[in-house]
C-alpha cells in the first residue's frame, strides 16, 4: 500500500536570467527510493538520479541544469521558455511510483522572487 506523500515547492516564480530550485520531498513512507526522474512540461526528461548510478543530465541541458540540492534540481540562466510544469517522479520499493508537480513562471520583471514553501537541508 502506498502511504507516502510528495511535497513540492508548488507554484514558483523566478526572474529571467536567474536560477531556481525545483524540490520534491517524499514523506510518510519507509520505501526505498530507487530512482528520481525530473521531466519538463513537454514530457522531455531533464535529469535522472539513480540510487546506485548517480545523476544523469540530458546533454542539451547540461549547461543550465545542475543536480541538487538533495534529490532536487537547479535550473540556471532561465528563459521565458522555461515557464511551465515540471514533474518529479519517485520510483520506490516496495511502494511504487509517486509523482509531484511544480509550476514555474519565469518573469521579465526584476522584482520577481523565488520563494519556496520549504527547503531541504
Amino acid at each position: 500500500m502506498m502511504t507516502g506523500t510528495i511535497e513540492t515547492t508548488g507554484n514558483i516564480s523566478a526572474k529571467k536570467g536567474g536560477s531556481v530550485i525545483l524540490q520534491c520531498h517524499l514523506s510518510s513512507t519507509m520505501a526505498q527510493v530507487t530512482q528520481v526522474n525530473w521531466e519538463q512540461h513537454d514530457h522531455s526528461l531533464l535529469a535522472i538520479r539513480n540510487a546506485e548510478l548517480g545523476w544523469h543530465i540530458y546533454p542539451a541541458f547540461k549547461d543550465r541544469v545542475a543536480p541538487g540540492p538533495g534529490l532536487g534540481l537547479t535550473l540556471q540562466s532561465l528563459t521565458m521558455n522555461d515557464t511551465g510544469e515540471y514533474f518529479c517522479t519517485y520510483h520506490t520499493y516496495p511502494d511504487g511510483t509517486y509523482r509531484g508537480r511544480i509550476f514555474l513562471e519565469v518573469l521579465e520583471s526584476s522584482v520577481a522572487e523565488h520563494s519556496a514553501r520549504f527547503q531541504i537541508p
Partner: antibody
Framework: EVQLVQSGAEVKKPGASVKVSCKAS????????IYWVRQAPGQRLEIMGR????????YYVDKFKNRATLTADTSASTAYMELSSLRSEDTAVYFC??????????WGQGTLVTVSS | DIQLTQSPSFLSASVGDRVTITCKGS??????LVWYQQKPGKAPKLLIY???NLQSGIPSRFSGSGSGTEYTLTISSLQPEDFATYFC????????FGQGTKVEIK
C-alpha cells in the same frame, strides 16, 4: 567518428584479476561518462558501474561494489575496468559504452574474459 | 527496477519479410525505451531511442512504437545485413536490458 576500442581476450585462473582497457576517440573524453556492461553466455546485458572521466568519480552496482575497480586516464583517453577474485561465473564478454544522457550511444567491440582452471 | 521481456527469443525470417519484435516491461516504461542491434563479435549499435526516434544513419526500414509497458521494433523489409540479435533497454526505473531476440535466416 566516435570509437571505443577495447583490449583483447583474456584467459584467467579462478581467484586472479583481470584489467580491461577501453580507448576512446572522436570526442572529448571528459564530457561523457563511461559505463561497463557485461554479458555472460546466454544471459542478458548487465550493468557493472560507471566512471566520470572528468573527475574520476565512480559508481558501482551493489553486486560489483567489492570486486570491480573503474579508473580512467584522461591523458590517454582510456578507461579501465579491473575485476578481482575471478570465478567461473565471471566468464563473459565485457563492454565499455558511452552514455549520452540516459542511453548508451557508442559501444566498444567487447572483450571476452574466460575464467577457467 | 523494471524487468524487460522480449518476444520471441528466436525468429526465422527471409529477406524482404516484415519483422516485428516486442519488448514488455514489468512496469510502465514511460516511452523511455531504446533498441539496439548486435552482430557476433561486434559492438552493439543504437537503432532507436525514446521509443520511436531513429538514430542518425540508421535506415528508415527500422521503426519503433509503443507506450506504457509494451513496445515494438519493426523492420519493414528485412535485408541480408539485418540478421542479428536485437535487444531493448529502458531507463524509466533503473537501467535494464531485455534478453535479446535473434533474427536468423529461414
Amino acid at each position: 567518428e566516435v570509437q571505443l576500442v577495447q583490449s583483447g581476450a583474456e584467459v584467467k585462473k579462478p581467484g586472479a584479476s583481470v584489467k580491461v582497457s577501453c580507448k576512446a576517440s572522436g570526442y572529448t573524453f571528459t564530457e561523457y561518462s563511461i559505463y561497463w556492461v557485461r554479458q555472460a553466455p546466454g544471459q542478458r546485458l548487465e550493468i557493472m558501474g560507471r566512471i566520470d572521466p572528468k573527475n574520476g568519480r565512480t559508481y558501482y552496482v551493489d553486486k560489483f561494489k567489492n570486486r570491480a575497480t573503474l579508473t580512467a586516464d584522461t591523458s590517454a583517453s582510456t578507461a579501465y575496468m579491473e575485476l578481482s577474485s575471478l570465478r567461473s561465473e565471471d566468464t563473459a564478454v565485457y563492454f565499455c559504452t558511452r552514455i549520452y544522457g540516459f542511453y548508451f550511444d557508442f559501444w566498444g567491440q567487447g572483450t571476452l574474459v574466460t575464467v577457467s582452471s | 527496477d523494471i524487468q524487460l521481456t522480449q518476444s520471441p527469443s528466436f525468429l526465422s525470417a527471409s529477406v524482404g519479410d516484415r519483422v516485428t519484435i516486442t519488448c514488455k516491461g514489468s512496469q510502465n516504461v514511460n516511452k523511455y525505451l531504446v533498441w539496439y542491434q548486435q552482430k557476433p563479435g561486434k559492438a552493439p549499435k543504437l537503432l532507436i531511442y525514446n521509443t520511436d526516434n531513429l538514430q542518425s544513419g540508421i535506415p528508415s526500414r527500422f521503426s519503433g512504437s509503443g507506450s506504457g509497458t509494451e513496445y515494438t521494433l519493426t523492420i519493414s523489409s528485412l535485408q541480408p545485413e539485418d540478421f542479428a540479435t536485437y535487444f531493448c533497454y529502458q531507463y524509466n526505473n533503473g537501467f535494464t536490458f531485455g534478453q535479446g531476440t535473434k533474427v536468423e535466416i529461414k
